[in-house]
Interface confidence: low
């Protein structure tokens, strides 16, 4: 696919932060602020948690996640998977796009230690028009939200 | 904002290097190397630690440090807060932009021990003519410089 | 250096991904997939770990690795070094252009635990025709490899 | 390959000092602690502790505080114990070990005898 | 102060299993490492981190940990293996490495 950026034309963007209603519990992606502070949207749509592409191209898309706790939840996995993946219509299944492991919250914590650790996610990607990228975090519980400038998910075209 | 890129036009970007100087005990930002080395300016200029914005758009801002230590010097907060802040003439406190909390340098690591971690920001922001962005880490003491490739800070125009 | 980006041309970008064959244990550069799955190559060309460059320019790079263990290798060092290194006809050696350390592996690490820790690198450089950019990870063995999505490497012109 | 080569063997009297060098190849010095034991004839090891040639930094077995002294020159990637008021008592093998985390390489030993 | 404790000696016939034990109360916590040392020379390293083997090392030789125990085992062991055998480990704060006292064992 040969690409080219047309000098009137507006290059796609967009930074989406993360807001209480972020967090669902549901086992979907993380939702994410569109309009309201840091957050905005050019040339991109939004739907239920996903940055949507209207024109398909090459984006770098890029994501990330405050995580914090004291020790860590009752049940919780040694590994937190951070990562962005794709929807598209062509294919009933989420492809993982980029992917972070970390274990901020093993037994060298002592089990009642505040603790913070960050992950950040960025690359390019080849993305269709009509295809959805959404970030998902597991084990949830462990991000940290405050005020967007932490937790935030963004896109754009190269 | 309807942004175009022009063809004709030179991108904005920069690239700006720890050096020596970067770490001033002064409560202030970082400072930054502008010429040396890897460091440059390209259509943005520098202002006591802050890149400042000639020409206003939507710009992908990022910023490294290298934290390290031999355990954790006295009276250090078991969180490291690592952060770009935008000045604007329009409001008299920083706002905060991208930022990162990080526990590196908890009861976990053993008391005379040398360790290292890394801390990487980057998203877009809308940033107007005559802003600035700086970055700022708390505790400064943690940030480890060396030859301006392990704590760094830039931006350019998307 | 004036760069202009011509509206008719494309910008260069790629994005490579970590397989198998990443780990030489030759002590040389990490490898890349260049074609399969989320690799591409577009006005960037590749040869032995390398990004070769064939349009100056102030290029983003960016490298994500996936590090993890049980345990830790015999002989590891205390510190992990992650970075991206450019090649250039005009000097014998490698030039460090943006670098990590990190110790996720020290003996704070309790016995016997799986551990996970991610590395990300980014930031803008300029490249001349010619040059090229290679990632290296000393102690490489505790680079973890899986489907391309948790290690990366790749670069766009900005 | 790796190789740890030791200085030789040094004859001392009661309250003098002895400093032992160790010199590192076949890796990066700065990337490993170098870490000190000895052990008596007959005896076990004792560990009296390590130094990051990196950074410099130290961390000495509370039994040998106030007289030890772990240093290291890069240039030469060379490690150094410096043991001071020697009593009869420390007469032993002094070995140099790399360790990141695990003491994987030994150096050959340095033999030192104090007596009057 | 933390100390880990092995028997003074182990004898064994030739081709026998030989069991040394290392006993230490932050075992659970902590990694165990046994060390082979021949008279005259440098001790070597012959598992690391409970029961990994370097590279080298015979395959009868073998670690495990359980709880408060260390074990190295010699699984047929051979008149060569005579030496004395060290356990350490490292101390609660991983700072400071700890030996044991060290096994004589006899293959006879």
């Known amino acids: 696919l040969i690409q080219e950026r047309r000098s009137h034309e507006v290059n796609p963007a967009a930074h989406l932060t993360g807001a209480n209603s972020s967090l669902t519990g549901s086992g979907g992606p993380l939702l994410w602020e569109t309009q309201l502070g840091l957050a905005f949207l050019r040339g991109l749509s939004y739907h239920d948690g996903a940055l949507v592409v209207t024109k398909a191209g090459y984006y770098y898309i890029y994501s990330k996640v405050q995580l914090g706790g004291v020790g860590c939840p009752l049940g919780l996995a040694s590994t937190i998977t951070h990562g962005l993946y794709k929807r598209t219509p062509r294919y009933p299944e989420e492809l993982e796009l980029l992917v972070s492991q970390q274990s901020p919250c093993g037994r060298a914590t002592s089990s009642s230690r505040v603790w913070w650790d960050s992950s950040f996610l960025g690359g390019v990607v080849h993305l269709e028009a009509g295809e959805e990228v959404v970030v998902r975090v597991l084990d949830e519980r462990l991000v940290r939200l405050r005020d967007g400038t932490r937790s935030y998910f963004g896109a754009f075209m190269v | 904002l309807i942004q175009e890129r022009r063809s004709h036009e030179v991108n904005p970007a920069a690239h700006l290097t720890g050096a020596n100087s970067s770490l001033t005990g002064s409560g202030g930002p970082l400072l930054w190397e502008t010429q040396l080395g890897l460091a440059f300016l390209r259509g943005l200029s520098y202002h006591d630690g802050a890149l400042v914005v000639t020409k206003a758009g939507y710009y992908y801002i990022y910023s490294k440090v290298q934290l390290g230590g031999v355990g954790c010097p006295l009276g250090l907060a078991s969180t490291i807060t690592h952060g770009l802040y935008k000045r604007t003439p329009r409001y008299p406190e920083e706002l905060e932009l991208l930022v990162s909390q990080q526990s590196p340098c908890g009861r976990a690591t053993s008391s005379s021990r040398v360790w290292w971690d890394s801390s990487f920001l980057g998203g877009v922001v809308h940033l107007e003519a005559g802003e600035e962005v700086v970055v700022r880490v708390l505790d400064e003491r943690l940030v480890r410089l060396r030859d301006g490739t392990r704590s760094y800070f830039g931006a350019f125009m998307v | 250096l004036i760069q202009e980006r011509r509206s008719h041309e494309v910008n260069p970008a790629a994005h490579l991904t970590g397989a198998n064959s990443s780990l030489t244990g030759s002590g040389g550069p990490l490898l890349w997939e260049t074609q399969l799955g989320l690799a591409f190559l577009r006005g960037l060309s590749y040869h032995d770990g390398a990004l070769v460059v064939t349009k100056a320019g102030y290029y983003y790079i960016y490298s994500k690795v996936q590090l993890g263990g049980v345990g830790c290798p015999l002989g590891l060092a205390s510190t992990i070094t992650h970075g991206l290194y450019k090649r250039t006809p005009r000097y014998p050696e490698e030039l460090e252009l943006l670098v990590s350390q990190q110790s996720p592996c020290g003996r704070a690490t309790s016995s016997s635990r799986v551990w996970w820790d991610s590395s990300f690198l980014g930031g803008v450089v300029h490249l001349e025709a010619g040059e090229e950019v290679v990632v290296r990870v000393l102690d490489e063995r505790l680079v973890r490899l899986r489907d391309g999505t948790r290690s990366y490497f790749g670069a766009f012109m900005v | 390959q790796v190789l740890l080569v030791q200085s030789g063997a040094e004859v001392k009297k009661p309250g003098a000092s002895v400093k032992v060098s160790c010199k590192a190849s076949?890796?990066?010095?700065?990337?490993?602690?170098i870490n000190w034991v000895r052990q008596a004839t007959g005896q076990g090891l004792e560990w009296m502790g390590w130094m990051n040639p990196d950074s410099d930094n130290t961390d000495y077995a509370q039994e040998f505080q106030g007289r030890v002294t772990m240093t290291r020159d890069t240039s030469i990637s060379t490690a150094y114990m410096e043991l001071s008021s020697l009593r009869s008592e420390d007469t032993a093998v002094y070995y140099c070990?790399?360790?990141?985390?695990?003491?994987?390489?030994w150096g050959q030993g340095t033999l030192v005898t104090v007596s009057s | 102060s933390y100390e880990l404790t092995q028997p003074p000696s182990v004898s064994v016939s030739p081709g026998q299993t030989a069991r040394i034990t290392c006993s230490g109360d932050a075992l659970p916590k902590k990694y165990a490492y046994w060390y082979q040392q021949k008279s005259g020379q440098a001790p070597v390293l012959v598992i690391y981190?409970?029961?990994k083997r370097p590279s080298g090392i015979p395959e009868r030789f073998s670690g495990s940990s359980s709880g408060t125990m260390a074990t190295l085992t010699i699984s047929g062991a051979q008149v060569e293996d005579e030496a004395d055998y060290y356990c350490?480990?490292?101390?609660?704060?991983?700072?400071?490495?700890?030996f044991g006292g060290g096994t004589k064992l006899t293959v006879l």
């Open positions: 350490y480990s490292t101390d609660s704060s991983d700072n400071h490495v700890i």
């Open positions: 070990a790399r360790g990141g985390t695990t003491l994987d390489y």
């Open positions: 981190e409970d029961s």
């Open positions: 076949g890796y990066t010095f700065t990337h490993f602690d």
